[in-house]
């Protein structure tokens, strides 16, 4: 579709002659008529198939033809064809005498053929005018002419349709040529699909509008390459969406069991040492003079038994007093008025006299102890063994029973369960007083993680495409991975062919 | 136990500003995304606000774009909107909860109430 | 935006009946949709997700079921404690919405 148009320049007729040889009276009062067809080696009768116009008079005799763009006596004159420019043309533009009406001539009778030409050649679209002179023997007219396409259309033959726009259809100019120049943010054939955000993930992201980066479920971030963990998962985190890989300290399905009580919650009081034993499980060593499930308790000042040699303790409110037993005295009956004449030393201690009589000291046999060697030793009242061993007194030594997970003289050296790697099937491993424990893998259980789970959502391959399946942290729930070049929950839609999204 | 405690709400003119705040605990604050859901006064549920783990990207509703900011502290385990231009069809129950735009809000705190009214 | 639409609006119920909601999406969710019960002057809370997924402490007789652009949540047998209002949304398109409620209270 487009226009051919003919600019009428000059037409000179000096003696004012018609093609008969007749003068015009009193002067030729000229219009124009055109005839446009398809290419004719011989220009012959008929039917104006690319078109026809006919002007109102322009002049009389010569004149200078002036543009006009409104109204009648449009100039350049207006051909317009439906149809794909062929490329050639014939061409007839006839001068006609009127002695009638000046704008309708054409209907007038009496008119008179002053002058013809006919062209017939080739002519490329475009912008470019190209001029012409016809002359014959008694007139001369100067014109030129082109061919250029409608609006909205475009190409060598005005036959490729294109119509800028910026809606839901598309987002594009037209170029030169009718090929489509997307706008800024959009690609596509039709420039109908956003370009997103740079860098947003292929397969987890997607948009509806340019530079935008919307995550598919499971994903988040600017980029839509941070996975999100599940939703009942409280103390973990994710390589893959919904996965609940527990944070250090933590395990159970939902990371929710807190493997190091001690660490998180400091429960045990007054310098005690707190040992992690299982899932919110703890135990409390407490110092001396302290008792209680977290040592709170603080014993009475007589409970160290500050009396020696047999005085009785009385307790006060800060502080505490002694009462000794005759030939005793001091703060802690340490001093006697007995000597060694008095036989003071017991289990066959031996007496050493000291301050020229005034005093005793006795040096017991193993095993025992005390300012007359009355007390059996006790080697376990210095809380020797560590993480919750058992004290127990073995004659001239004392031995340290450890509670599982624990060795050592002192019960100070922790066994590592979780060295031997005990969990199967990549399942975590936990080192806890009763010994390790596993958290499991989806789709495995059992103390070891050894039992595959076989009900689990995978089992019946929902993940297409290649995907790899990976079971929720519910039996009935999955996550599919998907290879590149697929998305959707189930990897069902190559990222070609996306789901269409609602804009 | 999983916590979410709002504050901030209150009454306010139009054109006016409110900023509120939500507390969270017992969970890894860090590894989860937050949002903010509101629901006008005996009305649905309408998704307001998210933000990313990382702080790196928020989201928001058409209507609240330009004049409400999510954020998070979470050093402190907060979350934050700020709310400017405040009109009255935003008056609601604003909700914190944990989830993103595409994920299911999987916890939810107690409400707190912005009133916008001259 | 996707619109979500659940149906009854609300409906009357006895304890001990098998109650439904559907909920219909105007486009196609993929499964990700989730199930909220609100009761009056209480937040609300997830049931579940993943269209058929039990969130973590929901009782058993809560079940979903549905695909493309058609949810259900059906209550197998009611409890006094399950009257309140229930909300489905979706989460597969930025943004993400929900369903109107619907008001489940006793005959």
């Known amino acids: 579709s487009g226009i051919f148009q003919l600019r009428l320049q000059e037409f000179a007729n000096e003696r004012g002659m018609l093609a008969n040889g007749r003068p015009c009276e009193p002067g030729c009062r000229t219009f124009f008529r055109i005839c446009l067809k398809h290419y004719q080696a011989t220009f012959s009768e008929g039917p104006c198939t690319f078109g026809n116009v006919s002007t109102p008079v322009l002049g009389t005799n010569s004149f200078v033809i002036r543009d006009k763009n409104s109204g009648s006596g449009r100039n350049p004159l207006q051909l317009p064809f439906n149809f794909t420019w062929p490329g050639t043309f014939s061409l007839n533009i006839q001068a006609w005498h009127t002695p009638g009406d000046d704008l309708r001539p054409e209907t007038s009778p009496g008119n008179s053929l002053i002058s013809q030409i006919i062209i017939q050649g080739s002519l490329a679209v475009g912008k470019n005018w190209k001029s012409d002179e016809q002359n014959n023997t008694l007139t001369r007219l100067r014109y030129s002419y082109r061919v250029v396409c409608s609006d909205n259309y475009y190409g060598d033959s005005c036959s490729r349709l294109c119509k800028k726009r910026d809606d839901h259809f598309g987002h594009y100019e037209c170029q030169p040529d009718g090929s489509l120049s997307c706008l800024p943010g959009w690609t596509g054939k039709y420039c109908d699909q956003p370009i997103c955000l740079s860098g947003c993930h292929e397969q987890n992201g997607y948009c509806s509008k340019p530079d935008e980066c919307n995550c598919r479920p499971g994903w988040q971030g600017p980029l839509c390459n941070e996975c999100i963990p599940h939703n009942g998962c409280r103390h973990g985190t994710c390589t893959i969406p919904w996965q609940c890989a527990c944070d250090e300290g933590w395990g159970g399905l939902f990371c929710d069991q807190d493997l190091n009580y001690c660490t998180h919650h400091s429960p045990c009081k007054n310098g005690s040492t707190c040992s992690n034993s299982g899932p919110r499980g703890y135990t409390c060593t407490c110092l001396p003079g302290y008792t209680g499930e977290h040592c709170e308790l603080e014993l009475s000042k007589c409970a160290s038994n500050p009396c020696r040699n047999g005085g009785s303790c009385k307790d006060h409110e800060n502080s505490y007093h002694c009462l000794c037993p005759p030939g005793y005295y001091g703060q802690h009956c340490e001093h006697s008025t007995l000597t060694c004449a008095d036989s003071p030393c017991f289990n066959g201690g031996s007496c050493r006299e000291r301050n020229q009589g005034a005093s005793y000291a006795c040096e017991c046999p193993p095993n025992f102890t005390g300012s007359n060697c009355e007390k059996k030793v006790d080697r376990c009242t210095s809380n020797p063994c560590a993480n919750g061993g058992q004290c127990l007194n073995r004659g001239p030594s004392r031995t340290c029973r450890c509670r599982p997970g624990f060795t050592g003289t002192h019960c100070e050296l922790h066994i590592s369960d979780c060295a031997r790697s005990p969990c199967a099937h990549g399942g975590t491993c936990h080192d806890l007083e009763n010994g390790p424990v596993c958290t499991c893998p989806a789709g495995f259980s059992g103390r070891r993680c050894e039992v595959r789970i076989t009900n689990d959502a995978c089992a019946s391959g929902p993940c297409f495409n290649g995907a790899t399946c990976y079971t929720g942290l519910s039996p009935n729930n999955f996550v599919c991975n998907c290879p590149y070049g697929f998305v959707g929950s189930r990897c069902e839609f190559p990222v070609g062919l996306p789901p269409s999204f609602p804009w | 136990e999983v916590q979410l405690v709002e504050s901030g709400g209150g009454l306010v003119q139009p054109g006016g500003s409110l900023r509120l705040s939500c507390a969270a605990s017992?969970?890894?604050?860090?590894?989860?995304?937050m949002a903010w859901v509101r629901q006008a006064p005996g009305k649905g549920l309408e998704w307001v606000a998210t933000?990313?783990?990382?702080?790196?990207?928020?989201s928001y509703r058409d209507s609240v774009k330009g004049r409400f900011t999510i954020s998070r502290d979470n050093a402190k385990n907060s979350l934050y909107l700020q709310m400017n231009s405040l009109r009255a069809e935003d008056t609601a129950v604003y909700y914190c909860?944990?989830?993103?735009?595409?994920?299911?809000?999987?916890?939810w705190g107690q409400g707190t109430l912005v009133t916008v009214s001259s | 935006d996707i619109q979500m639409t659940q149906s009854p609006s609300s409906l009357s119920a006895s304890v001990g009946d098998r109650v439904t909601i559907t909920c219909r999406a105007s486009?196609?969710?993929?499964?990700?949709l989730a199930w909220y019960q609100q009761k009056p002057g209480k937040s609300p809370k997830l049931l579940i997700f993943d269209t058929s997924v039990l969130a973590d402490g929901v009782p058993s007789r809560f079940s979903g079921s549905g695909s493309g652009t058609d949810s259900t949540l059906t209550i197998s047998s009611l409890q006094p404690e399950d009257f309140a209002t229930y909300y489905c949304q979706q989460y597969t398109y930025y943004p993400p919405t929900f369903g109107q409620g619907t008001k489940l209270e006793i005959k």
């Open positions: 486009q196609e969710i993929y499964r990700n």
């Open positions: 909860a944990r989830g993103y735009y595409n994920s299911p809000f999987a916890y």
């Open positions: 933000i990313s783990s990382s702080d790196a990207w928020p």
């Open positions: 017992g969970f890894t604050f860090r590894h989860f995304p």
